[in-house]
């Protein structure tokens, strides 16, 4: 004759996640849950994240009876309240000789003359503030600019008339313009001297420079 199987509430234990079963009646039981779990069989992990302590935009990640903070890259520590020193982590954070300065929640670059941008990678367009004479072409350089003059103009800003236009140098001499004052400079061929290379040279000197 078969015997009815006897129901024992705690055998096997219905409590999960390490909960301890206690029989409370013939057909009833109670689970004593480990910290961090709840429910009649301890099946639910309690969410520890409500009103969490992760700061500076840290994201709460629930654990068992605890939580972790996932921090933005510029913060670290248990609650994302420790500043990351980006200048140590990224030695080349600032380019072109810029100096890295760590700040709370980030960093900044102090750029050398002629460079700008968050990482000092942008060459400042010096032509934006240049005063090359209209008609000339501005060429941007690092922390400076130069003006390319049209024919007939001279000087650093192309604001002077080119004295060489009138061919003041004679006898095949080379004519250059002084960029500061616009005056011509004649480089005389062998045998000639003078401001415009019109004088004969008695002694055997080679080239003579004359400014005018």
């Amino acid at each position: 004759a078969g015997s009815d199987s006897l129901y024992v509430p705690c055998a096997p234990s219905p409590c999960v996640n390490g909960g301890t079963c206690r029989q409370t009646g013939d057909f009833t039981f109670e689970c004593n849950c480990l910290p961090g779990f709840e429910g009649s069989t301890c099946e639910r992990n309690i969410d520890d994240c409500p009103n969490h302590r992760c700061q500076n935009g840290g994201v709460c990640v629930d654990g068992v009876n605890t939580y972790n903070c996932r921090c933005p890259p510029q913060w670290t520590g248990q609650f994302c309240t420790e500043d990351v020193d980006e200048c140590l982590l990224q030695p080349n954070a600032c380019q072109n000789g810029g100096t890295c300065a760590n700040r709370n929640g980030g960093y900044g670059c102090v750029c050398v003359n002629g460079w700008s941008g968050d990482d000092c990678s942008e060459n400042i367009d010096d032509c934006a503030f240049a005063s090359c004479t209209p008609g000339s072409t501005c060429i941007d350089r690092v922390a400076s600019f130069s003006c390319m003059c049209p024919e007939g103009k001279a000087g650093l800003l192309c604001h002077l008339d080119d004295a060489c236009i009138s061919n003041p140098c004679h006898k095949g001499a080379l004519c250059d313009t002084n960029p500061l004052n616009g005056q011509y400079i004649c480089t005389c061929p062998q045998g000639y001297k003078g401001a415009d290379c019109t004088e004969d040279v008695d002694e055997g000197n080679s080239h003579h420079h004359h400014h005018h």
């Epitope: 520890d48 409500p50 009103n51 302590r53 700061q55 500076n56 935009g57 654990g63 068992v64 605890t66 972790n68 520590g77 248990q78 609650f79 309240t81 420790e82 709370n104 929640g105």
Partner: antibody, heavy 117, light 112 residues
């Protein structure tokens, strides 16, 4: 420079209400929780609870739940600790604090609350 | 709550001598993230506590190197290698691994 400046000392009678303040400056106020820490005469500090300025959410030490409330005014970057009915056992120094490298890295100067009939 | 037990309650040390303070927790302070959130504070009369050491052994900015921290799990030590007159204070350990944060009872350091 991070600074937490608290309101002055208070002497109250049992049953009276009280609101003490903590003004934060030198940092982004809404990015950090403000803690309140109690220190009874001759004893060690005890963490009471904190408020999240951004949301106004609070978390308390179970030991202090229901005894006081914590609030915040973001516009004036000020946190408050308030009692509706003081008891003699509330006599203590109350500090506000902010996290940094460790828990409670930056502290206010403290507010002494004396409750006596 | 985690109970933090400090010893001794008070300590008298000669100037220039070593002072050692112990702190024991009722449970391991190793967090699930692998770090141990045990910190040390100094409190002088009429002042708020001041952070000295965070996460067992990291000196907070401006803290003299005569202060050092060590330990693991449940047992931790704060050492003042050469006591100075300005070190007279009460020292507290604090754990923030488990909710809620709990302080030790304090150790009073005096000059012998």
């Amino acid at each position: 420079e991070v600074q937490l400046v608290q309101s002055g000392a208070e002497v109250k009678k049992p049953g009276e209400s009280l609101k003490i303040s903590c003004k934060g400056s030198g940092y982004t106020f809404s990015n950090y929780v403000i803690h309140w820490v109690r220190q009874m005469p001759g004893k060690g500090p005890e963490w009471t609870g904190y408020i999240i300025p951004g949301s106004g959410g609070t978390k308390f030490n179970e030991k202090f739940k229901g005894q006081a409330t914590i609030s915040v005014d973001k516009s004036s970057t000020t946190a408050y600790l308030q009692w509706s009915s003081l008891k003699a056992s509330d006599t203590a120094m109350y500090y506000c604090a902010r996290d940094g490298a460790g828990s409670f890295t930056y502290w206010g100067q403290g507010t002494l609350v004396t409750v006596s009939s | 709550d985690i109970v933090m037990t400090q010893s001794p309650d008070s300590l008298a040390v000669s100037l220039g001598e070593r002072a050692t303070i112990n702190c024991r927790s009722s449970q391991s302070l190793v967090h699930s993230d692998g770090n141990t959130y045990l910190h040390w504070y100094q409190q002088k009369p009429g002042q708020p506590p001041k952070l000295l050491i965070y996460r067992i052994s990291n000196r907070f900015s401006g803290v003299p190197d005569r202060f050092s921290g060590s330990g693991s799990g449940t047992d931790f030590t704060l050492t003042i290698s050469s006591l100075q007159a300005e070190d007279v204070a009460v020292y507290y350990c604090l754990q923030s691994t488990h909710f809620p944060d709990t302080f030790g009872g304090g150790t009073k350091v005096e000059i012998k």
